[in-house]
C-alpha cells in the first residue's frame, strides 16, 4: 500500500480529520446514505466505503478535506488487501479448525448479537 | 432465522460440538483448506463458510456431527442476515459519520493491524 505512514497512524489521523471537517461534511441536509443497523462493522466495509464515495462526490474538495478522503481511500486499500488474504493460503484441516474455533470464540465474546 | 435457540447459545453449542468432533474432522490428512492469514475474522466470513462447505463434503455424516454442520449453516444464515442489514437503511450524513467514526475507532483499538 503506497502510504508513508503505518495504517494504525493513518486511522488515528483520519479520526482527527473527520472531527475537524464534520461541519463541512454535514452541510448537505438532503443527502441520505445507507447506514448499517448493527455494530459488527467489519461485515459492512463495502457499504461503508460506498457511503464514503457518495459523501466525497457531494463534498466541495480542497485543503485538508482532500487529505481526509485520500486517507479513507488508503484505509480501503488496506482492508481490500486484508480481504485478499482471507483465501490466499491453503492449510491443513487442523489449522482451519483452529481458525474456525477462534472465529466462533470471537463471535461468542465480542460480537453484538441480537436475540 | 428458523432456529429455536438464540444465536449466542447456538455459537456456544457449536464451539462444544467442534471440540467433540475434532478427531473425525481432521481424518482427511491430504485435505487443504484456505485459512485467513490474519485475525480480522469478520472480513473473511465468506471464505470461512466456503471452507466449512469443503469440510462438510469430505466428512462422513451421521449423529451429532450433522448437528455441527446444521448449526454452522444457521450461523451463516445469521451472518448473511447481518450483512443484508449493512445497507438496508438510509440515514442523514450525521448518522453516517457517527457510524464511520465508530468503525475507525474500533479499527484503531480492536483490529490487529500489521505494520
Amino acid at each position: 500500500i503506497p502510504t508513508e505512514i503505518p495504517t494504525s497512524a493513518l486511522v488515528k489521523e483520519t479520526l482527527a480529520l473527520l472531527s475537524t471537517h464534520r461541519t463541512l461534511l454535514i452541510a448537505n441536509e438532503t443527502l441520505r446514505i445507507p447506514v448499517p443497523v448493527h455494530k459488527n462493522h467489519q461485515l459492512c466495509t463495502e457499504e461503508i466505503f460506498q457511503g464514503i464515495g457518495t459523501l466525497e462526490s457531494q463534498t466541495v474538495q480542497g485543503g485538508t478535506v482532500e487529505r481526509l478522503f485520500k486517507n479513507l481511500s488508503l484505509i480501503k486499500k488496506y482492508i481490500d488487501g486484508q480481504k485478499k488474504k482471507c483465501g490466499e493460503e491453503r492449510r491443513r484441516v487442523n489449522q482451519f479448525l483452529d481458525y474456525l474455533q477462534e472465529f466462533l470464540g470471537v463471535m461468542n465474546t465480542e460480537w453484538i448479537i441480537e436475540s | 432465522i428458523p432456529t429455536e435457540i438464540p444465536t449466542s447459545a447456538l455459537v456456544k453449542e457449536t464451539l462444544a460440538l467442534l471440540s467433540t468432533h475434532r478427531t473425525l474432522l481432521i481424518a482427511n490428512e491430504t485435505l487443504r483448506i484456505p485459512v485467513p492469514v490474519h485475525k480480522n475474522h469478520q472480513l473473511c466470513t465468506e471464505e470461512i463458510f466456503q471452507g466449512i462447505g469443503t469440510l462438510e463434503s469430505q466428512t462422513v455424516q451421521g449423529g451429532t456431527v450433522e448437528r455441527l454442520f446444521k448449526n454452522l449453516s444457521l450461523i451463516k444464515k445469521y451472518i448473511d442476515g447481518q450483512k443484508k442489514k449493512c445497507g438496508e437503511e438510509r440515514r442523514r450524513v450525521n448518522q453516517f459519520l457517527d457510524y464511520l467514526q465508530e468503525f475507525l475507532g474500533v479499527m484503531n483499538t480492536e483490529w490487529i493491524i500489521e505494520s
Epitope: R90, Q95 | T30, R32, V37
Partner: antibody, heavy 118, light 107 residues
Framework: EVQLVESGGGLVQPGGSLRLSCAAS????????MAWVRQAPGKGLEWVSS????????YYGDSVKGRFTISRDNSKNTLYLQMNSLRAEDTAVYYC???????????WGQGTLVTVSS | DIQMTQSPSSVSASVGDRVTITCRAS??????LSWYQQKPGKAPKLLIY???NLEVGVPSRFSGSGSGTDFTLTISSLQPEDFATYYC?????????FGGGTKVEIK
C-alpha cells in the same frame, strides 16, 4: 495413497539442458504449492524452487535463478523443472515435494539423479 | 536470506537415550519451522510442522518446541529406526532454508 514420481534425470554435459517431471497422485494437486529440493552427493538439503497453486507465482533459490524454470500443469497433475545452462555444481538428487505454504514440505518423491559432467 | 544453524552436526547415542537437536534462525521466524528425518538413499520425511505439530503417523517420542529464533527437536527415547539425519527448515519466507543437518549415529 499419496505418490510423487520424478523422472527426467540423467547425465548431461555442462551448459546443457534437462527437463524434470513429477507426476502426482492421491491428493488434490491444485490445493498445494509444489517445490523442488535437491541434495548434492554427501551434502545436505537445498531448496531450489516453489510454485503457487495456479502456477502464477514462482520462487527460486539464488543459485538457480535465471537458469531454471518451474511450472505445473494442474490438468495433468504434473510438476516440471526446466534446467538450462547446467553446471557441475547442479549435480544432485532432485526431489519433488508438495508444500503447505507456511508449514512444511508434506510429501516427497523418491528423487531423480541429475549428473552434470563432461 | 534467513540462515538456519543446526547443532550438533552429529551425535552418538544409544537406544533408549534422550536426544536433543537445536536449530537457530538468523532472524525471527515465529513458529514457522519444520523438522525432517532422512535415511541413507531415501527421501526426507516430515516429522513436525509449525514448530510443535506432530505429522500424522509420526511416533509421539518425537516432539518440537521453541519460537522466534531458537528451536528444539527432542527424541525422548531413541529407537533403532531413529538413526538417521535430521534437518530443520524455516517456512516463514522465500528462499526456504534448511539447517545443515544432524546425523544421529549408534554409539
Amino acid at each position: 495413497e499419496v505418490q510423487l514420481v520424478e523422472s527426467g534425470g540423467g547425465l548431461v554435459q555442462p551448459g546443457g539442458s534437462l527437463r524434470l517431471s513429477c507426476a502426482a497422485s492421491g491428493f488434490t494437486f491444485s490445493h498445494y504449492y509444489m517445490a523442488w529440493v535437491r541434495q548434492a552427493p554427501g551434502k545436505g538439503l537445498e531448496w531450489v524452487s516453489s510454485i503457487s497453486y495456479e502456477g502464477d507465482i514462482t520462487y527460486y533459490g539464488d543459485s538457480v535463478k535465471g537458469r531454471f524454470t518451474i511450472s505445473r500443469d494442474n490438468s495433468k497433475n504434473t510438476l516440471y523443472l526446466q534446467m538450462n545452462s547446467l553446471r557441475a555444481e547442479d549435480t544432485a538428487v532432485y526431489y519433488c515435494a508438495s508444500q503447505t505454504l507456511r508449514e512444511s514440505f508434506d510429501y516427497w518423491g523418491q528423487g531423480t539423479l541429475v549428473t552434470v559432467s563432461s | 536470506d534467513i540462515q538456519m544453524t543446526q547443532s550438533p552436526s552429529s551425535v552418538s547415542a544409544s537406544v533408549g537415550d534422550r536426544v536433543t537437536i537445536t536449530c537457530r534462525a538468523s532472524q525471527d521466524i515465529a513458529n514457522y519451522l519444520s523438522w525432517y528425518q532422512q535415511k541413507p538413499g531415501k527421501a526426507p520425511k516430515l516429522l513436525i510442522y509449525g514448530t510443535s505439530n506432530l505429522e500424522v503417523g509420526v511416533p509421539s517420542r518425537f516432539s518440537g518446541s521453541g519460537s522466534g529464533t531458537d528451536f528444539t527437536l527432542t527424541i525422548s527415547s531413541l529407537q533403532p529406526e531413529d538413526f538417521a539425519t535430521y534437518y530443520c527448515l524455516q517456512d516463514k519466507e522465500f528462499p526456504r532454508t534448511f539447517g545443515g543437518g544432524t546425523k544421529v549415529e549408534i554409539k
